[in-house]
Every structure is written in structure tokens, then in C-alpha cells.
């Protein structure tokens, strides 16, 4: 069964990736890219670290953990449906073909509650899925908006929500990890 990571539109997504530095402060360059890991480097780079610091990043992409201790997990801020896909975490260990590569799948779900949705495409016949409409609006306009108080029609989804949050926690604890040295 495939391992994937999930977040909702408007939330932050978390993609785990770790390594254990050979010695404190002895860091290894890491790159994050969109799309599967190529033979070398990362494609469509969104963030990069060197031996000392984060030396390249793009908006919405950041490292929330202590990357100096090898936690190079990626946080993507305020996700949209367009953020769905494969992300490459590449730990660039010195030497020929020594890199560790991890392809992580990120699935973005439409927000569970969509009050007065903004412009969306082909919504007329779309159907509810976990109190959402399946995402056929331009990803960049699928905003979360302000959430109304919970009502009875939402209670039936609580089991699904619990399942999803439990899965997210399980996956958070099972991220890509390697030891160096």
C-alpha cells in the first residue's frame, strides 16, 4: 500500500525527511524539488541547504525543524490543489552516486467546508465528498475562507476526519530517515 501525505487546501503541508549528521554541525547539502528525483540534483527546486545554512528557498516553502540536527522536513504554507504531486528530498552525500533520494507523495484535499466558494470551474454537477466539492476549481482560487460553526450535517464526517488525522500523525512519525557516518 502506498505511503502518502495529505493536507487540506489552506492548511500547511508537512513532508518528513531526516538524516543524522556524522558530527554536530557537520551538515550535508539537501535539496527539495517538485517532481520525482532525477538522477542528479532536484528538478524544479523549491528549497536548498548547503553545509551551513538554507541558501535558497521560494515563497511558501520552508524548513520548520532544526535542519542543523538533520531535520530537513519541508513545510509548504497555505497549500492549494496545485501543490498535489511528488516531491523529492535529496540528501547530497559527498562522493559519486552516494545521494539518498526520497520521493514523497502529497495529496491536497479540498477544504471540508467551503462557504460561498470563490470562482471555481465546472462546479454545477460536482458532488460532495467529505463535505467538499471535488476540486475542479482553479487551485489558486480554492480558498478556505472563514469556517461556520459545526452543524449536524458535518457530524457524519467526524470518523473520516479522525481517520485522516491519525494517518497524518502515523506518517509524520514514519518519515524518510537516514544515518550518515
Amino acid at each position: 500500500s502506498e505511503v502518502e501525505y495529505r493536507a487540506e487546501v489552506g492548511q500547511n503541508a508537512y513532508l518528513p525527511c531526516f538524516y543524522t549528521p556524522a558530527a554536530p554541525g557537520n551538515l550535508v547539502p539537501v535539496c527539495w524539488g517538485k517532481g520525482a528525483c532525477p538522477v542528479f540534483e532536484c528538478g524544479n527546486v523549491v528549497l536548498r541547504t548547503d553545509e551551513r545554512d538554507v541558501n535558497y528557498w521560494t515563497s511558501r516553502y520552508w524548513l520548520n525543524g532544526d535542519f542543523r540536527k538533520g531535520d530537513v522536513s519541508l513545510t509548504i504554507e497555505n497549500v492549494t490543489l496545485a501543490d498535489s504531486g511528488i516531491y523529492c528530498c535529496r540528501i547530497q552525500i559527498p562522493g559519486i552516486m552516494n545521494d539518498e533520494k526520497f520521493n514523497l507523495k502529497l495529496v491536497i484535499k479540498p477544504a471540508k467546508v467551503t462557504p460561498a466558494p470563490t470562482r471555481q470551474r465546472d462546479f454545477t454537477a460536482a458532488f460532495p465528498r467529505m463535505l467538499t466539492t471535488r476540486g475542479h476549481g482553479p487551485a489558486e482560487t480554492q480558498t478556505l475562507g472563514s469556517l461556520p460553526d459545526i452543524n449536524l450535517t458535518q457530524i457524519s464526517t467526524l470518523a473520516n476526519e479522525l481517520r485522516d488525522s491519525r494517518l497524518a500523525n502515523d506518517l509524520r512519525d514514519s518519515g524518510a530517515t537516514i544515518r550518515i557516518g
Epitope: 496545485a82 504531486g85 479540498p110 465546472d122
Partner: antibody
Framework: EVQLVQSGAEVKKPGASVKVSCKAS????????MHWMRQAPGQRLEWIGY????????KYNEKIKGKATLTSDKSSSTAYMELSSLRSEDTAVYYC????????????WGQGTTVTVSS | DIVMTQSPSSLSASVGDRVTITCKAS??????VAWYQQKPGKAPKLLIY???NRYIGVPDRFTGSGSGTDFTFTISSLQPEDIATYYC?????????FGGGTKVEIK
């Protein structure tokens, strides 16, 4: 490993119906919608519709609505497509496909089922 | 529905050649375009999604680019196993629609 296994080839007479199955494995069946496509000989791929096994929500391509009926069986993780009132122009390879999740690109496909309509 | 116009419909190239296929959408689809490879008697195989992102297991020689209405798919160095028909597909709106295909052959 995600797998979609479709039923075998069918030869039908005009006016008949046919039901094609697509058995899914390697993932939680109710977490993803199942799409159906067809490809007539020498033609481009055409999207038929999708079904959400979680709630039986269905959406069809308006251009060919009424030709196909989509159903699913959660207990066997199987999706079905029934084609009715078959005509020679319905001769095609029919595919089931799973999207990545809420976005309509398709990493996983069944092997295809050839439906031939001939008198 | 969004119409995807693909060109050329067929091409012949030598092993090692750079091959380029274009796809034009009838309206702006941002970067919501995927590319597939289909070999005779087989199902399509996803190569690229969201215009430029390679799917898992896809060789680096396959790349995609573009946004808005104009998209390009490139095989940087054609290999014998790349002989197939290639399709673009917009995933911006329902119904998803495909291009007419480009048949790639070896000279």
C-alpha cells in the same frame, strides 16, 4: 503497489449492453474516485466519467451522457461501467484509471478492455 | 470543453535526436497539463504532470514546459524504447481532455 485489473474483451451485437469491471488493489478503494476513458481505433482518448466509491457520487461527460452507467462495490474494491444500446461507434478500448487524488491526472491505469460492436 | 491541439501528428527521428512535441489549449489552463506515453496495445503511462513535473520512475530525458495555452514536451535524446504515441491532457477542468497524439518513430 496500486493495480487496476479489468475484465476481458467483449464482442457484442448492436443494441446490446456490456458491463466492464475494474478491480482495484494496493490502496484504500474509497479514498479515490475511479475514472473511465475510452479510445476508439485511431482516435484520441476520451474521458467518460468518474465514480466516488466512498459515496457513489458520479459525474459523466455531458457529450456522451446516457451511454455509460458507473457503479462500484466497496466490498470487492471493484468499479463497473455498463454500456447500453451499443452501436458500432462504441467499438473502442475502455480504460479505468485512478487519479492522484482530487487532481485529474492519472498515474494508474487498467490494462484496457476491448469492446467490439459488430452485427 | 477545452480542446487540446497537438502537433505534429507524427514524426520520425534518429536515435539520440532531440524530439519536441507541442500542445495548444483552446483556453488558459495555467500549468495544468499532463503528458502520457502509449505503446501499441498498452494503457497510457503518465510521464509529466502540472506541465513540468516528472512522475516517479520517468527518465530524466523526458521534460515538459509551458503555461497558459502553449506547452512543450521534449525527449532530449531519443532512445529505441521511446517509440510510442504521446498525448497531452489538460487537468484544469472537467471533462479532462486529451490531444490527438503524436506518433514518434525511428528513422
Amino acid at each position: 503497489e496500486v493495480q487496476l485489473v479489468q475484465s476481458g474483451a467483449e464482442v457484442k451485437k448492436p443494441g446490446a449492453s456490456v458491463k466492464v469491471s475494474c478491480k482495484a488493489s494496493g490502496y484504500t478503494f474509497t479514498n479515490y474516485v475511479m475514472h473511465w476513458m475510452r479510445q476508439a481505433p485511431g482516435q484520441r482518448l476520451e474521458w467518460i466519467g468518474y465514480i466516488d466509491p466512498d459515496n457513489d457520487g458520479i459525474k459523466y461527460n455531458e457529450k456522451i451522457k446516457g451511454k455509460a452507467t458507473l457503479t462500484s462495490d466497496k466490498s470487492s474494491s471493484t468499479a463497473y461501467m455498463e454500456l447500453s444500446s451499443l452501436r458500432s461507434e462504441d467499438t473502442a478500448v475502455y480504460y479505468c484509471a485512478r487519479d492522484f487524488g482530487y487532481v485529474d491526472w492519472f498515474p494508474y491505469w487498467g490494462q484496457g478492455t476491448t469492446v467490439t460492436v459488430s452485427s | 470543453d477545452i480542446v487540446m491541439t497537438q502537433s505534429p501528428s507524427s514524426l520520425s527521428a534518429s536515435v539520440g535526436d532531440r524530439v519536441t512535441i507541442t500542445c495548444k489549449a483552446s483556453q488558459d489552463v495555467t500549468t495544468a497539463v499532463a503528458w502520457y506515453q502509449q505503446k501499441p496495445g498498452k494503457a497510457p503511462k503518465l510521464l509529466i504532470y502540472s506541465a513540468s513535473n516528472r512522475y516517479i520512475g520517468v527518465p530524466d530525458r523526458f521534460t515538459g514546459s509551458g503555461s497558459g495555452t502553449d506547452f512543450t514536451f521534449t525527449i532530449s535524446s531519443l532512445q529505441p524504447e521511446d517509440i510510442a504515441t504521446y498525448y497531452c491532457q489538460q487537468h484544469y477542468s472537467i471533462p479532462p481532455t486529451f490531444g490527438g497524439g503524436t506518433k514518434v518513430e525511428i528513422k
